[in-house]
Interface confidence: low
């Protein structure tokens, strides 16, 4: 980009340096070079000379016109051909930007990950604006009516210690950039209703040799929440379809879940939990692989998981909470 250049003239953009993508724009260049009546004025975009749509307005000024400008950023500069000068002389340069005003932020959501000490608020920003867009998160206590504001470029972590106005709040988001400003609807939250339990982790698996061999999955969470509902999903690594089991869980001890699986097949497991009856789920836990033996008992522990990675595996998924893309968290 153009930051600090020594200008011998002026360059400007109509309607503005930052404008709505797809607009027609005009870039004007006016030379002010000592002892130079320019023979010709040239425009460059990102270092490449423009050949078309240049109009000479008067002795010192020219205009470059673009129809339907779609580039998010461009560095423009112009030069003059001066008599008795071997090289073109730089007049000036300018960075231009095109983009969109922000959409109304929607789907504002706030969650507290257990032990994080923060309330994480996120929203759907809408379509890409291409230009610098800031967000102001407003948090207003419904008990004290005190309002706090937080400036951010994306999501925000708000320390729960700073939420001194009781348990009930209104949260809304304002989005603003050079092309406009929008405000979301207000979200009403109760701090006790938005806690996501500490992550559930699968620690090991073992297959017990019996008349019908069974696999036991050991899993745990550090949560202090008493009533927790969990889901475990599993599938053969060669399959696309997951099986889902549901559990009502008390994490005072390590959980043991039994599965009757096919022998000599590599399986993948994941688990996630939520506070029973509440809205938000944990992200799915990291992939845990276990290969069932042909006949001999086998134990797979977390420490050896890197050895069991199958680089050819495609973990395709659903974000119903029953399959998720790229193992991303599904909080809905």
């Amino acid at each position: 980009g153009i930051t600090n250049i020594n200008c011998s003239g002026h360059i400007w953009v109509e309607p503005a340096t930052i404008f709505k993508m797809g607009m027609n724009i005009s870039i004007y260049c006016q030379a002010a070079i000592k002892n130079c009546q320019p023979r010709k004025l040239h425009f460059y975009k990102n270092g490449i000379k423009e050949r078309f749509q240049i109009t000479r307005i008067n002795k010192t000024t020219a205009r470059l016109w673009y129809k339907n400008f779609l580039e998010p950023h461009a560095s423009m500069y112009c030069t003059a051909e001066c008599p008795k000068h071997f090289q073109e002389t730089l007049i000036c340069g300018k960075d231009i930007s095109s983009g969109y005003p922000p959409d109304i932020p929607d789907e504002v959501t706030c969650v507290i990950y257990e032990y994080s000490g923060n309330m994480t608020c996120t929203w759907n920003a809408g379509k890409l604006t291409y230009i610098d867009t800031k967000y102001v998160v407003h948090v207003k206590s419904l008990e004290t009516e005190e309002e706090q504001q937080y400036l951010t470029s994306s999501y925000i972590n708000i320390s729960t210690d700073s939420l001194q106005g009781g348990k009930k709040y209104l949260v809304w988001v304002q989005a603003a950039n050079a092309l406009g400003m929008e405000e979301s609807k207000q979200l009403q939250i109760h701090l006790d209703d938005i806690v996501i339990p500490s992550a559930a982790v699968i620690s090991r698996a073992e297959t017990i040799n019996a008349t019908v061999p069974k696999t036991i999955i050991y899993w745990d969470s550090q949560t202090t929440i008493e009533k927790v509902s969990c889901e475990m999903r599993y599938k053969a690594t060669t399959n696309q379809t997951w099986n889902v089991k549901e559990f009502d869980t008390n994490f005072t001890y390590v959980q043991q879940s039994e599965f009757y699986l096919e022998p000599n097949i590599k399986y993948v497991f994941q688990v996630r939990c939520q506070e029973t009856g509440k809205r938000y789920w944990q992200p799915w836990s990291s992939l845990f692989f276990h290969k069932t033996p042909e006949t001999v008992p086998q134990v797979t522990s977390k420490a050896f998981q890197h050895d069991t990675w199958n680089s050819g595996l495609t973990v395709a998924s659903i974000s119903t909470g029953h399959l998720t893309s790229d193992n991303r968290g599904d909080i809905g």
């Epitope: 789907e107 959501t109 994306s154 395709a316 659903i318 974000s319």
Partner: nanobody, 121 residues
Framework: QVQLQESGGGSVQAGGSLRLSCAAS????????IAWYRQAPGKERKFVSA???????SYADSVKGRFTISQDNAKNTVYLQMNSLKPEDTAMYYC???????????????WGQGTQVTVSS
Amino acid sequence: QVQLQESGGGSVQAGGSLRLSCAASGYTYCNYDIAWYRQAPGKERKFVSAIASDGITSYADSVKGRFTISQDNAKNTVYLQMNSLKPEDTAMYYCKTDPISTITRICDPYWGQGTQVTVSS
């Protein structure tokens, strides 16, 4: 805001079939997958099946091999084909949008109003 409308419920004899539909309308910037849940009288709502936008499916053990989930993207509709129905399949069936989430984009889920399925022996 997304609206969901279920249809296709009804009464059927054990061993019979029904096809439920879940039609989604309303525009959102979030990408959603669709899940079916059911709730028997006096019981909690339970997951039945789900389908992602790329067609990958998920089923509860209790319906695997009997139920098939599918989608028609052109019609914004997801179907649940229920075969070999059992009396224990009797419940109100709900569809739900499930958002694909990242830390910078958590989207709201939406529920439909439900459609009743009754299986008699």
